[in-house]
């Protein structure tokens, strides 16, 4: 969490951003809130990115003004216009690119004063793994697949019966580049598993951590998955 305060002759207002991560090729949100104002026409929101000449987005007098928007953000940004009056300056970003990573500034002017806060935006790819029994194999194996990751993650397996101990010798992981030549498909096979045990496939890079669990019994297969973004901190 980053909290910024305005300076200058005018009073300062508190602006709060949240460090977040964007999933390449998907739509993202850059979070920013500020002390609300009762008059929409008095509110100016400017989003800027370090190293970029033009603006990322500007909202003033109750509507967007994209006259000075940088070409790299053309047709890709929007604020939640109906929530601005309540202090929400968060930015919607379409089709997140690797190059969108960087330091952004959320700059606010209201009748109460000015304020700004920086936001670190990380970009990468992350997806929930699916764990299945690999029936094609001669032994009882588990196959963990996740379609999109970047940068290349680490993969570890753990077993409940072994008190969460990691298996290093008995699994094999491969990374296959996807068609857009950035993200990769992750496939990991765990060999010689035993029945009535819960196994976890854990995939992690510096942006996200995902887990796929599977429990195989004589009568059923139970699955569970979880994805957690790392380093979401407020400013």
């Amino acid at each position: 969490l980053i909290i910024g305060f305005g300076i200058s002759g005018r009073h300062s207002i508190t602006v709060t951003t949240l460090t977040s991560a964007g999933n390449i090729g998907e739509d993202g949100i850059l979070s920013c809130t500020f002390e609300p104002d009762i008059k929409l026409s008095d509110i100016v929101i400017q989003w800027l990115k370090e190293g970029v000449m033009g603006l990322v987005h500007e909202f003033k007098e109750g509507k967007d003004d994209l006259s000075d928007q940088d070409e790299m953000f053309r047709g890709r940004t929007a604020v939640f216009a109906d929530q601005v009056i309540g202090g929400n300056a968060s930015l919607r970003l379409k089709n997140v690119q690797l190059t969108d990573a960087g330091t952004y500034k959320c700059y606010i002017i209201t009748s109460k004063g000015k304020g700004n806060a920086n936001l670190e935006y990380k970009t990468g790819a992350f997806s929930i793994p699916e764990v299945n029994v690999d029936y094609n194999a001669s032994s009882e194996n588990l196959r963990c697949e996740a379609p999109r990751w970047f940068p290349q993650p680490t993969v570890v397996w753990a077993s409940q019966a072994d008190q969460g101990a990691n298996f290093s010798e008995v699994f094999n992981t491969s990374f296959e580049l996807n068609s857009e030549n950035v993200t990769m498909k992750v496939v990991s096979v765990l060999y010689n598993v035993t029945i009535n045990n819960t196994y976890s496939c854990m995939i992690e890079n510096d942006i996200a951590k995902a887990t796929g669990d599977i429990k195989v019994t004589d009568s059923e297969i139970k699955r569970r998955s979880h994805l957690q973004l790392l380093n979401s901190k407020a400013s």
Epitope: D27, L66, G75, A81, K94, N95
Partner: antibody, heavy 120, light 107 residues
Amino acid sequence: QLQLQESGPGLVKPSETLSLTCTVSGGSIKSGSYYWGWIRQPPGKGLEWIGNIYYSGSTYYNPSLRSRVTISVDTSKNQFSLKLSSVTAADTAVYYCAREGSYPNQFDPWGQGTLVTVSS
Amino acid sequence: EIVMTQSPATLSVSPGERATLSCRASQSVSSNLAWYQQKPGQAPRLLIYGASTRATGIPARFSGSGSGTEFTLTISSLQSEDFAVYYCQQYHSFPFTFGGGTKVEIK
């Protein structure tokens, strides 16, 4: 409500320049949350996005047509225009102008369209 | 560019029946997809944007679903005025592209 109306010659000779104008009424072309776009549709075929312009004059064109297309805006007349150079018979189409959301980028509303035939 | 493929090319349906139109993108477009209706001699009309949000004034019998690469437009009970050509359009990345259209005709 907002309305768009295309105007321009219905017949253009091969190798010449096609010129169309779209007049916006019932609203300002300076409305901040919108681009203004051109789309075309050859007879009996599908739709092709040509490009768009913001009221400040910044443009974006379809790469397949970029070398031949110019879109301009005249805010004083509440109009924007399309020029397509070096036309051939393949450019024969109904040309539509439309308001394009800045994001989401849907087209709404559309002009009624004008048929431009390229023939000598 | 992203290629949009619609199926079927023609759909024959009786009035009152349900119509299901498909649109597939050559790569993920998230939810950045719109649907349009076009009648002969008329301009297209926006029905759906954001894959599932109905445009202003569009009847509830029109609904959109899907995300990523697979999308569906459903007309729950076809009225006589619904017989037309329907186009999907992706606005995920430039250049924006349209599908080839699905003609919904009276059976």
